[in-house]
């Protein structure tokens, strides 16, 4: 029986060219991790193995660095990053477990505190 | 000034599928996201998901996942719903609501979907 | 899924009366950064849901200031300080933090 749950950061809003720490946790269950999948949408970003240590896929090594801890950092962010991010965490014996955080990139002046919304 | 114009309303049978459109003006589409959302008849409203016009990418919560499709059609800044193999549990008004920072500041008039043989 | 309850269920007021609305959540709403999305609708009858407050305490454009919004954490309010005869319909609070959003089950303000 999976008792596990997972706490994520919550959803991002942050500002173009910034950078944010994605992070998940997963408490509740005496399983073990043996590995940590980060996704978006369908595009893999990055694993991290219980024996094997990190891979950043290619096509995000300028972007993406591994930690802190399972977690991991955006960094330069573009309006494309906007999207929603799974953390996949493979366990045994329970099986997968899986987070959502949504990053939304604003333009500067309306990221976080600054957001107004009447700017059209 | 901002506006979200919803097609009309829907009276369609068991078991068919139907799409809605949102055609949004007076702002920049793709620098917002755009949320659905569910009203059953003197229910509660619950979230459906949102749609990023920007790149096309979705978040659906899971209890619309396989009932409900969101897509955007840039080029005309129109969004739209299309709602699968329709139950009378689907009969409902639904609404489509501008979204940033996490929170819905413009919605569209609502469009009434009822699904009956 | 988060869940948010919203008290009371149906609240009966007097035009000029002063009245609260709480929204709790099952998890706390503040994400890492510090930053909570909890934001307040007025649903009235035959109109679309409109927006009220939005990030705990801010009013959105054209929201008069009889509106105010507090709390954090898993605890928040939306205070009307005098209430008027367009005041009346569905409040509901809606949780963005975590996916899926989630709303409040609402509550009807009405006339005593």
């Known amino acids: 029986m999976m008792t596990g749950t997972i706490e994520t950061t919550g959803n991002i809003s942050a500002e173009k060219g910034g950078s944010i720490i994605l992070q998940c946790h997963l408490s509740s269950t005496t399983a073990q991790v043996t590995q940590v999948n980060w996704e978006q949408q369908d595009q893999l970003l990055a694993i991290c193995n219980a024996d094997l240590g990190w891979h950043i896929s290619p096509s995000f090594k300028d972007r993406v660095a591994p930690g802190p801890g399972l977690g991991l950092t955006l960094q330069s962010l573009t309006v494309n990053d906007t999207g929603e991010y799974f953390c996949i965490y493979h366990t045994y014996p329970d099986g997968t477990y899986t987070g959502r955080i949504f990053l939304e990139v604003l333009e500067s002046s309306v990221a976080e505190h600054g957001a107004r919304f009447q700017i059209p | 000034e901002v506006q979200l114009q919803q097609s009309g309303p829907e009276l369609v049978k068991p078991g068919a599928s139907m799409k809605i459109s949102c055609k949004a003006s007076g702002y920049s589409f793709t620098g917002y996201t755009m949320s659905w959302v569910k009203q059953s008849h003197g229910k509660n409203l619950e979230w459906i998901g949102l749609i990023i016009p920007y790149t096309g990418g979705t978040s659906y919560s899971q209890k619309f996942k396989g009932k409900a499709t969101l897509t955007v059609d840039k080029s005309s800044t129109t969004a739209y719903m299309e709602l699968l193999s329709l139950t009378s549990e689907d009969s409902a008004v639904y609404y489509c609501?501008?979204?940033?920072?996490?929170?819905?500041?413009?919605w569209g008039q609502g469009t009434s979907v009822t699904v009956s043989s | 899924d988060v869940v948010v309850t919203q008290t009371p269920l149906s609240l009966p007021v007097s035009f000029g009366d002063q009245v609260s609305i709480s929204c709790r959540s099952s998890?706390?709403?503040?994400?890492?950064?510090?930053?909570?999305?909890l934001s307040w609708y007025l649903h009235k009858p035959g109109q679309s849901p409109q927006l009220l407050i939005y990030g705990i305490s801010n009013r959105f454009s054209g929201v008069p200031d009889r509106f105010s919004g507090s709390g954090s954490g898993t605890d928040f309010t939306l205070k009307i300080s005098t209430i008027k005869p367009e005041d009346l319909g569905m409040y509901y609070c809606l949780q963005g933090t975590h996916q899926p959003w989630t709303f409040g089950g609402g509550t009807k303000l009405e006339i005593k």
């Open positions: 998890q706390s709403l503040a994400n890492s950064y510090g930053n909570t999305y």
């Open positions: 609501a501008r979204s940033r920072t996490f929170a819905m500041d413009y």
